[in-house]
């Protein structure tokens, strides 16, 4: 697993030699995924025209990104911590497979993406151990994955291109919702 | 208007226990992170307790753990401090305190502090 | 308990501009931008001014900036005014305390 700045290593790659729960550790965690995605967001936007595309444009898409809605509890009015809590590992945890996706779609940030799935899968572990309705939590089909990963992989460059920036922007706009509402936890 | 009200303070003796109360008023409390925070006679601010938005995570002080416990009821809005074998460094006006909402360890609103003060 | 360095006073005259200075380590101010200031007026209960190290709270005037370099955060106040003679506080996370605070800065704006 990558190091964050300002972490020790032996924090990241054994997760257990520290109390969990650190509020502080979840944030900057975050907070670096962020860095990641920014740092790949700018690669995708040098390469394609993809950034400029309308909000309305990119939205006729049929993939079905994890986001936050009311119902999840994460936002000011109506927060409820247990319910967002488990919002945001199911969230994650369905992530997981677009950012599989994303593995093989970066040259010069090749290893920044490989950062940012790495950091999301200790995230999850952090949260996982702060969560205490851990029963809620569902945890996506590994065939579905598979399958899923299949079809991304199949389109043609354009769809590839609009799919990446899509997971980008989503997997931002989630993990901001997230950060927020964990500074409350 | 955001209004935080303490009461509960008063006068202890050394191994005494006090509960604090904290009633919230003016917005959505189950929403925020609260805390505890005193001040001893012409001293500076310390931290003593924080609580999430839910009451599913607490954190203490070193100086209180084991001996104070903080615990909300965001049904009736209020924060409570169980403050259990009391010590005199433990005199100071306790401030109720709520973290500005998705904003990591600053306070935005504070109440205006209850008295506890620990002699014999 | 163990806190921030901050000078105990500092003064100036009206129009003039002080700065504040909180003194931590990389454990503290160094290790994020997790820095706050509060204002104390005589016999009142704290104010944020400042959070995240430069950013003002809700309602106060822009006479007020903070910043950090290193482990030192600083809190300057421009254009004096009498109505800023108050303790000021920084905090700070750090790690295992959650918060820690100064101890306190006594700002006097002279005659």
């Known amino acids: 697993a990558p190091v964050l700045p300002g972490e020790d290593s032996k924090d990241v790659a054994a997760p257990h030699s520290q109390p969990l729960t650190s509020s502080e550790r979840i944030d900057k965690h975050i907070r670096y995924i962020l860095d990641g995605i920014s740092a790949l967001r700018k690669e995708t936007c040098n390469r394609s025209n993809m950034c400029e595309s309308s909000k309305e444009a990119l939205a006729e898409n049929n993939l079905n990104l994890p986001k936050m809605a009311e119902k999840d509890g994460c936002f000011q009015s109506g927060f409820n911590e247990d319910t967002c809590l488990v919002k945001i590992i199911t969230g994650l945890l369905e992530f997981e497979v677009y950012l599989e996706y994303l593995q093989n779609r970066f040259e010069s940030s090749e290893e920044q993406a490989r950062a940012v799935q790495m950091s999301t899968k200790v995230l999850i572990q952090f949260l996982q151990k702060k969560a205490k309705n851990l029963d809620a939590i569902t945890t996506p089909e590994p065939t579905t994955n598979a399958s899923l990963l299949t079809k991304l992989q199949a389109q043609n460059q354009w769809l590839q291109d609009m799919t990446t920036h899509l997971i980008l922007r989503s997997f931002k706009e989630f993990l901001q919702s997230s950060l927020r509402a964990l500074r409350q936890m | 208007e955001v209004q935080l009200v303490e009461s509960g303070g008063g006068l202890v003796q050394p191994g005494g226990s006090l509960r604090l109360s904290c009633a919230a008023s003016g917005f959505t409390f189950s929403s925020y992170a609260m805390s505890w925070v005193r001040q001893a006679p012409g001293k500076g601010l310390e931290w003593v307790s924080r609580?999430?938005?839910?009451?599913?995570?607490?954190y203490y002080a070193d100086s209180v753990k084991g001996r104070f416990t903080i615990s909300r009821d965001n049904a009736k809005n209020t924060l409570y401090l169980q403050m259990n074998s009391l010590k005199p460094e433990d005199t100071a006006v306790y401030y109720c305190?709520?973290?500005?909402?998705?904003?990591?360890?600053?306070?935005?609103?504070w109440g205006q502090g209850t008295q506890v003060t620990v002699s014999s | 308990q163990s806190v921030l360095t901050q000078p105990p006073s500092v003064s100036g005259s009206p129009g003039q501009t002080v700065t504040i200075s909180c003194a931590g380590t990389?454990?503290?101010?160094?290790?994020?931008?997790?820095v706050s200031w509060y204002q104390q007026l005589p016999g009142m209960a704290p104010k944020l001014l400042i959070y995240?190290?430069?950013k003002r709270a809700s309602g106060i005037a822009d006479r007020f900036s903070g910043s950090k370099s290193g482990n030192t955060a600083s809190l300057t106040i421009s254009g004096l005014q009498s109505e800023d003679e108050a303790d000021y506080y920084c905090a700070s996370y750090r790690r295992t305390i959650d918060n820690i605070f100064g101890g306190g800065t006594h700002l006097t704006v002279l005659g």
């Open positions: 305190v709520r973290y500005a909402w998705g904003v990591q360890w600053a306070f935005d609103f």
């Open positions: 990389s454990e503290d101010v160094g290790y994020g931008n997790y």
């Open positions: 609580i999430s938005s839910g009451g599913i995570s607490t």
């Open positions: 995240d190290v430069n």
